[in-house]
């Protein structure tokens, strides 16, 4: 049995340009201790989209639902979507360390952008 699952329930999300996109992610536990980060793409060239404690992400807002009893919500909303935002977004759990160690990624959510 897995100690931690990172769940991205939507395989894809389609949003009109200028609107906001909600990317959902839950984790079954806070343990192991460490942050959840959001990336677009995979590999060394992936782009950091949101980190709870580091960096400035003016278009990204955490939209967690704290009432969820059986898991932790790490969903985000990205505002003012443009075609350049299209891609696959991953919710990634890290174990705290020096540096933090990547443990598990969600399956990814593909964001497509429709014309206005």
């Amino acid at each position: 049995e897995e100690e931690l699952q990172v769940i991205q329930p939507e395989k894809s999300v389609s949003v009109a340009a200028g609107e906001s996109a909600t990317l959902n992610c839950t984790a079954t536990s806070l343990i192991p201790v460490g942050p959840i980060q959001w990336f677009r793409g995979v590999g060394p060239g992936r782009e950091l989209i949101y980190h709870q404690k580091e960096g400035h992400f003016p278009r990204v807002t955490p939209v967690s639902d704290p009432t969820k009893r059986n898991n932790m919500d790490f969903s985000i909303r990205i505002s003012n979507i443009t075609p350049a935002d299209a891609g696959t977004y991953y919710c990634v759990k890290f174990r705290k360390g020096s540096p933090d160690v990547e443990l598990k990624s969600g399956a990814g959510t593909e964001l497509s952008v429709r014309a206005k």
């Epitope: 100690e3 536990s29 959840i36 059986n70 174990r95």
Partner: antibody, heavy 118, light 112 residues
Framework: EVQLVESGGGLVKPGGSLRLSCAAS????????MSWVRQTPGKGLEWVAT????????YYPSSVKGRFTLSRDNAKNSLYLQMNSLRAEDTAVYYC???????????WGQGTTVTVSS | DIVLTQSPASLAVSLGERATISCRAS??????????MHWYQQKPGQPPKLLIY???NLESGVPDRFSGSGSRTDFTLTINPLQAEDVATYYC??????????FGGGTKVEIK
């Protein structure tokens, strides 16, 4: 009904060792993060140790790190706290607590008393 | 360490009136918009019991006269109306991703 039953407390001399156990029933033990929290007489609560559901990850505050070791046996629905090099300040009631998400302590046992005195 | 300061240390309230307990954290306990602050009730000779999880969510089976509010560093537990069986000590607890997890010093609630 969730039940957590602690055992193994007692009187021990400074520098001695004790092993506390917590027997769990009424829930899927292997899915839960488990912890120990202690309460000193007339004082407040102090987190002592936490272990992940599968036993891979353990966490301790600096006050017990290197002296206490937390383990679990999911086949036996049991949690264990090995306490070595005990000090007078470790005297407390020790509670076993379960947490589905590793966030709040959802259920608590009745506690077992540890007294460290010469 | 994140220090949790509860106030007042003790509180005497008339039956049927409102009891309000404060918990202030030395730094934010919020992650992704969720406040990892929880409240417990402990009666003499008993273990603590979870009342409120993640700042404002009532644990199953807990009467709705208990409520929690707050975010980041400032949190409140409210009992309204206070009943005789609510005489107990109440603790706040933070479980953010900054170890160690810590508890407040407790607030003893009595009947005036």
């Amino acid at each position: 009904e969730v039940q957590l039953v602690e055992s193994g407390g007692g009187l021990v001399k400074p520098g001695g060792s004790l092993r506390l156990s917590c027997a769990a029933s009424g829930f899927t033990f292997s899915s839960y993060v488990m912890s120990w929290v202690r309460q000193t007489p007339g004082k407040g609560l102090e987190w002592v140790a936490t272990i992940s559901s599968g036993g891979t990850y353990t966490y301790y505050p600096s006050s017990v790190k290197g002296r206490f070791t937390l383990s679990r046996d999911n086949a036996k629905n049991s949690l264990y706290l090995q306490m070595n090099s005990l000090r007078a300040e470790d005297t407390a009631v020790y509670y076993c607590a379960s947490s589905l998400t590793g966030s709040s302590f959802d259920y608590w046992g009745q506690g077992t008393t540890v007294t460290v005195s010469s | 360490d994140i220090v949790l300061t509860q106030s007042p240390a003790s509180l005497a309230v008339s039956l049927g009136e409102r009891a309000t307990i404060s918990c202030r954290a030395s730094e934010s306990v919020d992650l992704y918009g969720t406040s990892f602050m929880h409240w417990y009730q402990q009666k003499p000779g008993q273990p603590p019991k979870l009342l409120i999880y993640r700042a404002s969510n009532l644990e199953s089976g807990v009467p709705d006269r208990f409520s929690g509010s707050g975010s980041r560093t400032d949190f409140t537990l409210t009992i309204n109306p206070l009943q005789a069986e609510d005489v107990a000590t109440y603790y706040c607890h933070q479980s953010s991703d900054e170890l160690p997890w810590t508890f407040g010093g407790g607030t003893k609630v009595e009947i005036k």
